[in-house]
């Protein structure tokens, strides 16, 4: 028991040696930095951890084992001392007692000593077994952590190489970005130059436009003057013709019949030999009141008096009863000829009405009514239509029987509402009905889903606002 050594072997394991009489006990313990804690027992098939556990637990565990070993050693030494003391006492007694008792006493003492030694040996064997168990466990843990460390080292190496790659890529991209920035700056400069050039060009164009506008104004004035001159010339020619017809009536009566000073409609203008499209002055028989109307001398044989035209939204059609009565707008552009004139004209002889329509997709259609007339103002210029043909719907988009004319200040429709106010413009509204060619003018891409647009239901449906419309009349027998 008196020989106890602690040393390190060649492979770095702690060596404990206990001398017990002729027996010598040697314990080889691994030099461990990390042991599994007692609270988490070792499981042989457990999944290996990616990272080792904290090392402190293992160190503490080893220290506990060392303390146990030292305690056991001290205990054994105490036992040895105690046995020696007992042996001394017993030797003295033996010497004092009679020789005959010596053998028996010796046997008894020997037996006691053997029993005690056997008991200690058993305890020591248990401790040894425990230590070996723990050692095996620690060795397995060490192996596991060693593997985990290797795996981590490999991962670190992989990550390091990955980082290096990314750094290379990053520097490459940085170079590329710098190059692109340079390119971008150059492009921006060229764009700026182009912009400056364009601005110069725009200012030039603006000045040109201003000049052109001035020229247009001048031309318009000149045109008006020319039209007046033409009108005066026409009157002079008509006067001359009248004078000639009066002086020559006996010689050639047909000349007097063929020439007229005024025309009631474009059919008469056409028949008089004027076959060019344009604005003409019309006068009703037995009337001095003149109206300017556009005559279409080409479409369907010519002679058409245009009573309404929509083409660009340049004229406001949300007008009063009086304005719709006498007419408004520009006869060579958007206009309304006038309900009074049309009413009087269509009540003198039978007229046909042709309505020509254009949509925003380049399509055209028409509705032709073989008989058309308007009632007098007393009957609110009620529309009368018969005999529909054409491509703009098999059903009439002007309600049948005809309705009274309504304007924003004269509500003659069949709706609780005021259709003219709801849908804008003057029209022969029902409640409010399938058409309104005097509605709001909407440009392309804004012309759908409109309550108050230029509508011809049986061609384009309820929400579609048309691009262009022309309403024209001509005597039925033309």
């Amino acid at each position: 028991y008196n020989n106890f050594r602690k040393s390190m072997d060649s492979i770095g394991k702690k060596q404990y040696q206990v001398q017990h009489g002729s027996c010598s006990y040697t314990f080889l313990l691994p030099e461990m930095d990390n042991c599994r804690s007692s609270s988490s027992p070792y499981v042989s098939n457990a999944v290996q951890r990616d990272a080792p556990l904290e090392y402190d637990d293992s160190v503490q565990r080893l220290q506990v084992l060392e303390n146990i070993m030292e305690n056991n050693t001290q205990w054994l030494m105490k036992l040895e001392n105690y046995i020696q003391d007992n042996m001394k006492k017993e030797m003295v007694e033996i010497q004092q007692n009679a020789v005959q008792n010596q053998t028996a006493v010796m046997i008894e003492i020997g037996t006691n000593l053997l029993n005690q030694t056997a008991e200690q040996t058993r305890k020591l064997t248990d401790v040894e077994a425990q230590v070996l168990n723990q050692t095996t466990r620690l060795e397995l843990q060490l192996l596991e952590h060693s593997l985990s460390t290797n795996k981590l080292e490999k991962q670190i190496l992989d990550q390091t190489s990955e980082i290096n790659k990314l750094q290379d890529k990053n520097s490459f991209l940085e170079k590329k970005v710098l190059a692109m920035e340079d390119k971008h700056i150059i492009q921006l400069q060229s764009i700026k130059e182009e912009k400056d050039q364009l601005q110069v060009l725009v200012s030039k164009q603006n000045s040109i436009i201003e000049e052109l506008e001035k020229k247009i104004v001048t031309a318009t004035v000149n045109n008006s003057v020319l039209q007046k001159q033409q009108h005066d010339l026409m009157e002079t020619v008509n006067n001359l013709l009248t004078m000639m017809s009066t002086s020559n009536s006996a010689k050639d009566p047909t000349v007097a019949k063929g020439e007229q000073i005024s025309f009631r409609d474009c059919a008469e203008v056409f028949k008089s030999g004027h076959t060019t499209n344009g604005v003409y002055t019309l006068t009703l028989p037995n009337s001095t009141e003149e109206v300017k109307a556009y005559c279409d001398m080409e479409a369907g044989g010519g002679g058409w008096t245009i009573i309404q035209r929509r083409e660009d939204g340049s004229v406001d059609f949300q007008r009063t009863w009086k304005e719709y009565k006498v007419g408004f707008g520009n006869p060579s552009g958007e206009y309304w000829l006038g309900n009074e004139f049309v009413s009087q004209l269509t009540n003198q002889q039978r007229y046909v009405l042709k309505i020509h329509l254009k949509d925003w997709e380049g399509n055209e259609a028409y509705s032709l009514y073989e008989h058309f007339y308007l009632s007098s103002e007393e009957l609110n210029y009620r529309i009368h239509l018969k005999g529909l043909t054409g491509t703009a719907g098999k059903i009439s988009s002007i309600s049948q029987p005809g309705n009274d004319f309504s304007t924003k200040d004269a509500d003659n429709d069949k709706c609780i509402c005021k259709c003219s106010q709801m849908l804008t413009g003057g029209w022969w509204f029902d409640a409010c009905g399938p058409s309104n060619l005097n509605g709001m003018y909407y440009p392309q891409r804004q012309n759908t889903n409109k309550f108050n647009g230029i509508k011809w239901y049986y061609w384009k449906g309820s929400g579609y606002s048309l691009k262009g419309t022309t309403m024209m009349i001509r005597p039925a027998g033309f």
Epitope: I416, C417, A431, S462, G463
Partner: antibody, heavy 121, light 107 residues
Framework: QVQLVQSGAEVKKPGSSVKVSCKAS????????MVWVRQAPGQCLEWMGY????????GYNQKFEGRVTITADESTSTAYMELSSLRSEDTAVYYC??????????????WGQGTLVTVSS | DIVMTQSPDSLAVSLGERATINCKAS??????VAWYQQKPGQPPKLLIY???TRDTGVPDRFSGSGSGTDFTLTISSLQAEDVAVYYC?????????FGCGTKVEIK
């Protein structure tokens, strides 16, 4: 009597489409426009669009443009509303309704019973 | 789009008393306004159109008024069966739009 009967409730996944039907009876199907209105939980009523069964003309609320398609089958007097690219916000009760006037999309005098469409992943 | 703002959001009125619901349009809608009644689990029902015209079969205790931007629905003598949500609707321009509703309850 005038009646609009809609198809049953639907549960749909986000990104999919739903097609709701509305069968009309008791009146001439082509004489009136048909509209679709939806009502999301705790939200206002929202007009989606209309169809004119007479000529197939349609009009849509710009909010749904490109996602909603309204069609009509004159032979069965049925209108359909298909909504695509569904998202959770499309969870709502969808109603079909008849307009009082053929020529204009005025007020709505007859309504279907509604179809609940739930959009959930 | 035209915004229709209803007020109040909810209204508690005693039986037989007058209930008044207001609706304000963000722009002039003339008289193109309708009112609907919606009871739980049911579709809306047309009550008034053209701001003041009662639909067929609607009791005369319901009346509508207004033009331009301000409109009112009045229930002159509230009945138990009038408990519902009421919506205003403009159809003056596309897209037609609705108010968000006024809940009418009995006090």
């Amino acid at each position: 009597q005038v009646q609009l009967v809609q198809s049953g409730a639907e549960v749909k996944k986000p990104g999919s489409s739903v097609k709701v039907s509305c069968k009309a009876s008791g009146y001439s199907f082509t004489d009136y426009n048909m509209v679709w209105v939806r009502q999301a939980p705790g939200q206002c009523l929202e007009w989606m669009g209309y169809i004119d069964p007479y000529n197939g003309g349609t009009g849509y609320n710009q909010k749904f443009e490109g996602r909603v398609t309204i069609t009509a089958d004159e032979s069965t007097s049925t209108a359909y509303m298909e909504l695509s690219s569904l998202r959770s916000e499309d969870t709502a009760v969808y109603y079909c309704a008849r307009t009082r006037d053929r020529y204009d999309v005025w007020y709505f005098d007859v309504w279907g019973q509604g179809t609940l469409v739930t959009v959930s992943s | 789009d035209i915004v229709m703002t209803q007020s109040p959001d909810s209204l508690a009125v005693s039986l037989g008393e007058r209930a008044t619901i207001n609706c304000k349009a963000s722009q002039d809608v003339y008289i193109a306004v309708a009112w609907y009644q919606q009871k739980p689990g049911q579709p809306p029902k047309l009550l008034i159109y053209w701001a003041s015209t009662r639909d067929t079969g609607v009791p005369d205790r319901f009346s509508g008024s207004g033009s331009g931007t301000d409109f009112t629905l009045t229930i002159s003598s509230l009945q138990a069966e009038d408990v519902a949500v009421y919506y205003c609707h403009q159809y003056s321009s596309y897209p037609p739009t609705f108010g968000c509703g006024t809940k009418v309850e009995i006090k």
